[in-house]
Interface confidence: medium
């Protein structure tokens, strides 16, 4: 008998994770028509594809891209020009500045004369032709053609004071989730934009150390809970004759304008009809207002009977954001996701009033996103299939039929490999791409929009599959546990040679923020995968109360009392995991980032003795220190007659004494524009005042993501050492 060669597979290493060795690819077509799309190839050529004729050719060569060090591009709708983007300089989460060059595809050369200024804050083509709108130094400019002189639309722009066509910090992060705040009408005639006035907003100032003798000070108008908010106005300008009539302001609905309010989104319905969404500062009332252009008045009119109110009686309006409408071909009726009578978010069809809305989907699951509405179909995603909240499948509802018939497009395509999808549709959904994120290896495919037939595999991550063949990956389970009347879904990552009769250290990874979801059927090879694979640690992620897609009763449980149930439910889960018999009760840790850092800190300070140690990265420590739009959405106002008491009770600092019997590692970037270093500074101060020992690490000049290569390597190495020490694992 020959001796067996044993298991030749190796465990993951921390280096694998830090080098991104096992990262996956997705393929999103850049649609330019019903059947044509562009895609940037591996070697940076921009390639044109026609699905029907099967032709493909390079529309823009990598040498042209390289000549200006371009990293991105945008084709004009008339296909005559391409903008090339270079000198990318990140600002906040979505915003960045860049240099733009216009390349003339007909002549094969860059457009000279009236070159664009630099750096530009935002630039986009009109939906038709090749008009350009761009934002430079907080003002909006228009070019009728790339070679034409620019026309200045706004003059009020001023750094940190007035923003035109781009959001200020809080709107970018907490309301729009975009770098832009301007929208072309479908025919390119009108340009709508928002003006944000931050003149009265308090400034957050922090040091940026750089390399100089003196640090720079970064100043950001940043409204914290209860502070003065930006003042918003929406304007629409006729881009055909911008000099004849200036920008026209769109009126705010009366019921909104009566107190502090937010603009939440803008959707063009047709060439002369626009839909604006507004939200009261107390974010349980949202108003959708449909406005029409009145040629005779040269104004935009928003009749009261075209105002639709959405209100929550149990929490805040919408999910994380209020959903946006998907209009029908008639440009009057629309489809929208909001809570039904049973508190589950579902698609409704609104023809005249919200009261008369027709519910399109129903059940104790949630519709998540409407991708596309065509003449006869509506495509949406939901977590309906087989009752797993952490899955996403794409459905088609045939809206021509009565009653509408529903088909799951993705449920049975690659059932084991793919349970979490998104989609990208061509203009009228003649074709679409499906991007599957897991639980198996991600795969992107192209489909016929009529028959749903798969036409082509766009990316199947073959190389990744091959390189993972000799890796011992942990086993991932998604299950649920019960406590009282509550159900908590959890994901458990088990070491490769997991043996139920043995005892393992447990690490809880938590986020837990309102309307978030951690337990998702997606593929990932990351730090926690390594900890399970190499270090033999069991990892668990639990979606407690306040998390999304399981109905409003579960979601709104945390309303006005953040920091209570999110923590309680993590503790409940840990107790249940201990009952399973394979967890070493003496070696349990918890870690989280951002909201997760807040929850992990409170869990460590719960006084339960469940945790030996834990890590908080960039934690919020008091909701008074965080952004108004976010904090107030879930907590109300920090005033005596509102919710100040819970703002005070829910701080990490209030529990400083309780950190005495745990090992705590506190980490923060000093240039965190989002969750300010102030949060960790206050935790540290409270711990010092209570004479509680703890460990800490700061990352100079790093923001909320601590994402620079060197910092990230240091961070994960440091956290690994801390954990291994806590769990008595040899290095």
């Amino acid at each position: 008998l020959r001796p067996s060669r044993g298991n030749t597979k190796r465990a993951l290493t921390l280096k694998d994770i830090l080098n991104g060795t096992f990262s996956y690819k997705t393929y999103f077509p850049n649609w330019i028509s019903e059947q044509e799309y562009l895609h940037q190839s591996e070697d940076d050529n921009i390639v044109f594809y026609n699905i029907e004729t099967r032709e493909s050719y390079i529309i823009l060569s990598n040498s042209t891209m390289k000549s200006v060090n371009a990293t991105d591009y945008g084709l004009s709708p008339d296909r005559q020009f391409v903008y090339l983007e270079s000198d990318y300089s990140k600002l906040w989460r979505y915003s960045y500045t860049a240099t733009y060059y216009i390349y003339d595809l007909q002549n094969g050369e860059f457009v000279r004369g009236y070159e664009l200024p630099r750096p530009i804050q935002y630039l986009c083509w009109s939906p038709v032709g090749s008009k350009l709108a761009y934002v430079y130094q907080n003002n909006i400019y228009l070019k009728q053609r790339p070679g034409d002189p620019p026309f200045q639309i706004t003059y009020t722009g001023r750094e940190n004071r007035i923003f035109n066509g781009i959001p200020d910090w809080v709107y970018e992060e907490e309301m729009l989730a975009t770098k832009y705040a301007l929208w072309w009408s479908p025919d390119g005639k009108f340009l709508a934009y928002v003006e944000f006035n931050d003149s009265d907003i308090p400034i957050i100032a922090y040091s940026y150390y750089g390399d100089g003798q003196y640090p720079r000070t970064i100043n950001i108008p940043y409204p914290k809970a209860g502070a003065k908010n930006p003042v918003v106005r929406v304007f629409i300008v006729d881009t055909t004759y911008p000099h004849h009539v200036g920008p026209m302001e769109v009126p705010v609905p009366e019921m909104i304008a009566s107190s502090d309010y937010y603009f939440s989104w803008l959707t063009w319905v047709s060439s002369e009809r626009v839909c604006l969404q507004w939200l009261k500062r107390v974010q349980n009332v949202s108003v959708l207002s449909i406005c029409d252009f009145r040629e005779d008045w040269h104004a935009w009119e928003c009749p009261k009977n075209q105002e639709h109110v959405e209100e929550s009686r149990t929490g805040w309006a919408g999910g994380f954001f209020v959903s946006t409408p998907a209009f029908s071909q008639d440009a009057t009726s629309y489809y929208k996701i909001f809570s039904d009578k049973d508190g589950y978010k579902h698609i409704h069809y609104i023809k005249d009033t919200v009261e008369n809305a027709i519910q399109i989907t129903s059940g104790k699951w949630e519709a998540i996103y409407i991708f596309r509405v065509t003449q006869d179909s509506l495509f949406y995603s939901s977590n309906e299939f087989e009752g797993y909240p952490g899955r996403r499948n794409i459905y088609r509802i045939s809206i021509g039929n009565s009653p509408p018939s529903k088909k799951c497009v993705t449920c049975h395509l690659r059932k084991e490999r793919c349970q979490y999808y998104t989609a990208s549709f061509s203009y009228k959904a003649k074709y679409y791409a499906l991007v599957c994120y897991g639980p198996g290896l991600p795969i992107s495919t192209l489909h016929d929009g009529r028959t749903d037939q798969e036409i082509q595999v766009l990316e199947e991550n073959k190389e990744l599959e091959n390189s993972l063949r000799n890796i011992q990956l942990p086993k991932v389970e998604i299950k649920k546990l019960k406590d009282g009347g509550l159900t908590f879904w959890y994901k458990m990552i088990l070491p490769p040679q997991f043996d139920r009769s043995k005892k393992y250290p447990l690490l809880i990874q938590v986020y837990g923020g309102p309307c978030s979801q951690s337990v998702k059927s997606v593929f990932a090879v990351n730090w926690i995968t390594y900890l399970a694979s190499k270090e033999g640690i069991v990892i668990a992620l639990v979606d407690g109360r306040g998390t999304a897609f399981q109905g409003d009763k579960f979601l709104h449980a945390v309303y006005r009392k953040l920091g209570v149930y999110e923590v309680e439910d993590q503790l409940t889960a840990v107790r249940k995991f201990i009952e399973m018999g394979f967890i070493d009760e003496e070696r349990i840790a918890i870690w989280g980032w951002s909201y997760g850092g807040y929850v992990s800190s409170l869990a460590l300070a719960s006084g339960t003795g469940l945790f030996k140690c834990g890590i908080a990265v960039a934690p919020v420590s008091s909701w008074e220190y965080y952004a108004s739009i976010y904090s107030e959405r879930f907590m109300g106002l920090p005033t005596k007659d509102d919710n100040l008491e819970h703002y005070k009770n829910s701080t990490v600092m209030a529990r400083a004494e309780y950190f005495r019997n745990v090992d705590y590692l506190l980490i923060h970037g000093t240039a965190d524009d989002n969750v300010h270093f102030q949060n960790s500074a206050q935790i540290a101060k409270a711990l010092v005042n209570a004479q509680v020992d703890f460990q800490a690490m700061w990352y100079s000049d790093q923001n909320h993501g601590i994402s620079s290569g060197r910092s990230q390597n240091h961070l994960y190495t440091h956290m690994t050492h801390f954990l291994k020490q806590c769990f008595s694992l040899s290095d």
Partner: antibody, heavy 119, light 109 residues
């Protein structure tokens, strides 16, 4: 303790009507979906109708659609089933049942009330 | 409509024996399946929900398993009070019509 007590059953002729009531106690009636399930003599269980918390959404088995109406009155913790145009095949023991707060299985059942439709 | 088929129709066993009841769904119902016990002259009683979770105060000799289309109710050691009719019920997506299986009668051999 959760209690569900059905009443209103009896003997009627085909085509006649009957209204069943279910008095609920021991739980917050307004927070739970409710349902009616019936069992013909010597047969299995058949779901008849359901009503959501709000009372705004009501559901029926095809066999009773258009003839039966479910309703609820949260002020007196009562569930109703209005049965019109009764047929011989509606003869059964009718149970009132409380659904789980998140899923449509039945956590608690009443003892039932007998409806006999006979000429 | 989702059809549930229970087998066998009748199971004749002695006290102390193991009972295995099957319920098959005409299409996947995920884990949305419950089991009930009904004794003569009594209302049904919830035993198992979500395919495998025991209801309050149900002895641990009752266990449920399965997902998708195949489900099993197991009674590890039959007690005299376990002889009854057992029904499965699907509540897939909690979306009507809710359906019950035809029942399995567990009788004393």
């Amino acid at each position: 303790d959760v209690q569900l007590v059905e009443s209103g059953g009896g003997v009627v002729r085909p085509g006649e009507s009957l209204r069943l009531s279910c008095a609920a106690s021991g739980f917050t009636f307004s927070s739970y979906d409710m349902g009616w399930v019936r069992q013909a003599p010597g047969e299995g269980l058949e779901w008849v109708s359901g009503i959501r918390v709000s009372g705004g959404s009501t559901y029926y088995a095809d066999s009773v659609k258009g003839r039966f109406t479910i309703s609820r009155d949260s002020s007196n913790n009562t569930l109703y089933l209005q049965m019109n145009s009764l047929r011989a095949e509606d003869t059964a023991l009718y149970y009132c049942a409380k659904e789980n707060d998140r899923h449509s299985f039945f956590e608690y059942w009443g003892l039932g009330t007998l409806v006999t439709v006979s000429s | 409509e989702i059809v549930l088929t229970q087998s066998p129709g009748t199971l004749s066993l002695s006290p102390g024996e193991r009972a295995t009841l099957s319920c098959r769904a005409s299409q996947s119902v995920g884990y949305y399946l419950a089991w009930y016990q009904q004794k003569p002259g009594q209302a049904p009683r919830l035993l198992i929900y979500d395919a495998s979770d025991r209801a309050t105060a149900i002895p641990d000799r009752f266990s449920g398993s399965g997902s998708g289309t195949e489900f099993t109710l197991t009674i590890s050691r039959l007690e005299p009070e376990d002889f009854a009719v057992y029904y499965c019920q699907q509540y897939y997506n909690n979306w009507p019509p809710l359906t019950f299986g035809g029942g399995t009668k567990v009788e004393i051999k």
